[in-house]
Interface confidence: medium
């Protein structure tokens, strides 16, 4: 069998809402994956499990089942959404994310995703991890790859 390639493309959109009383941030983060089947037979994408971490704490998980079948030598782009909650010991972030004197409230999140594919009864898991910028201050739609975290930018004084 040839490889099944999973490429994490990036954050597609992030929709934010707040609970003022609880000082809690709710972020619905939609991510995009490209899954390429390099085989001459179809493979089934059985499930996608994803989690999002902020500051080494898991803030959201998602699982999608029976997603799609990818034909021979074909590629499919799949979007999946992870609902996340930044609260409790991280409620200090509420102040940052809602501070109006900053326009872009970027936080760095670690996106982890595992894709399980099956073919002829055999299953295979492929995992990816990527750090991404997400704006926790407003609803944002990203061009693919735009949210990638490369290095921490130091503000110019």
């Amino acid at each position: 069998p040839r490889s099944i390639d999973v490429k994490y493309i990036g954050v597609k959109s992030a929709y934010v809402s707040y609970d003022v009383q609880k000082r809690t941030i709710y972020l619905n983060i939609t991510n995009t994956l490209n899954i390429t089947n390099n085989n001459y037979y179809s493979v089934e994408v059985e499930n996608i499990t994803a989690q999002v971490q902020f500051s080494k704490t898991v803030i959201g998980k998602a699982r999608l089942n029976n997603i799609t079948i990818i034909g021979p030598l074909d590629m499919k782009q799949i979007d999946y959404t992870v609902p996340t909650v930044i609260a409790e010991e991280m409620s200090y972030m509420y102040d940052f994310c809602t501070l109006i004197s900053i326009k872009v409230h970027n936080i760095v999140l670690m996106m982890q995703v595992t894709v399980t594919t099956t073919y002829f009864g055999h299953s295979e898991q492929i995992s990816q991890e990527r750090y991404q910028y997400v704006d926790c201050g407003r609803n944002t739609t990203y061009q693919l790859g735009q949210s990638e975290y490369l290095n921490v930018l130091q503000p110019q004084q």
Epitope: Y92, D95, F96, L99, I100, S101, I102, K103, V104, N106, P155
Partner: antibody, heavy 123, light 112 residues
């Protein structure tokens, strides 16, 4: 050096509208919000709203919704405020002022102001 | 909206003396990040407003160190030591913690 240039005066008839300009120079236009402030004769200052020239994101004082519309022209580095359905209450001096934008917390915000445009509404 | 109150419409002062101008806000302007989102402006007669103090206590560029700002979350003071004739004008406080930004009604500095 940083400059915000505004025309000196505008005379308009009641019910008409006017578009005030604020020409920015001497800095990166898209890196600073532009604020607009109203001052009626003998009165204090009233914040109208602001606009981010990089993406035209705006915030308005509720008192000016439907009255003021803020826009920018990035190419000419000019901010505009359109005032509609003018009445004598709109007779005032209108100032533009800049504030650092982007991921920067406001530091020396509103550090440069235009000279103001005096709008007189009279028939 | 946050209401900014400057109780004294005017303050008379003799040149060379010190003067304090006060301002109150209806809500604390102290953010949990440690910054207090208050400005002080001076508007000289027939001129545009000029930034004096930002974030309650920071002196803006080019402003003489005779000016200083202090305060708590809701009560603020602009102090001018050794007042000069050119300090005449109306002093405004302004909050920028929340939209809409709001100004105080102003305090006029008058030379005795």
């Amino acid at each position: 050096q940083v400059q915000l240039q505004q025309p000196g005066a505008e005379l308009v008839k009641p019910g008409a509208s006017v578009k005030l300009s604020c020409k920015a120079s001497g800095y990166t236009f898209t890196s600073y919000w532009m604020h607009w402030v109203k001052q009626r004769p003998g009165h204090g200052l009233e914040w109208i709203g602001n606009i981010d020239p990089s993406d035209s994101d705006t915030h308005y004082n509720q008192n000016f919704r439907g009255k003021a519309t803020l826009t920018v022209d990035k190419f000419s580095t000019t901010a505009y405020m359109h005032l509609s359905s003018l009445t004598s209450e709109d007779s005032a001096v209108y100032y533009c002022a800049r504030s650092r934008g982007g991921t920067y917390d406001y530091g020396e915000a509103m550090d440069y102001w235009g000279q103001g445009t005096s709008v007189t509404v009279s028939s | 909206d946050i209401v900014m109150t400057q109780a004294a419409p005017s303050v008379p002062v003799t040149p060379g003396e010190s003067v304090s101008i006060s301002c109150r806000s209806s809500k604390s302007l102290l953010h949990t990040n440690g910054n207090t989102y208050l400005f002080w402006f001076l508007q000289r007669p027939g001129r545009s407003p000029q930034l004096l103090i930002y974030r309650m206590s920071n002196l803006a560029s080019g402003v003489p160190d005779r000016f200083s700002g202090s305060g708590s979350g809701t009560a603020f003071t602009l102090r001018i030591s050794r007042v000069e004739a050119e300090d005449v004008g109306v002093y405004y406080c302004m909050q920028h913690l929340e939209y809409p930004f709001t100004f105080g009604s102003g305090t006029k500095l008058e030379i005795k």
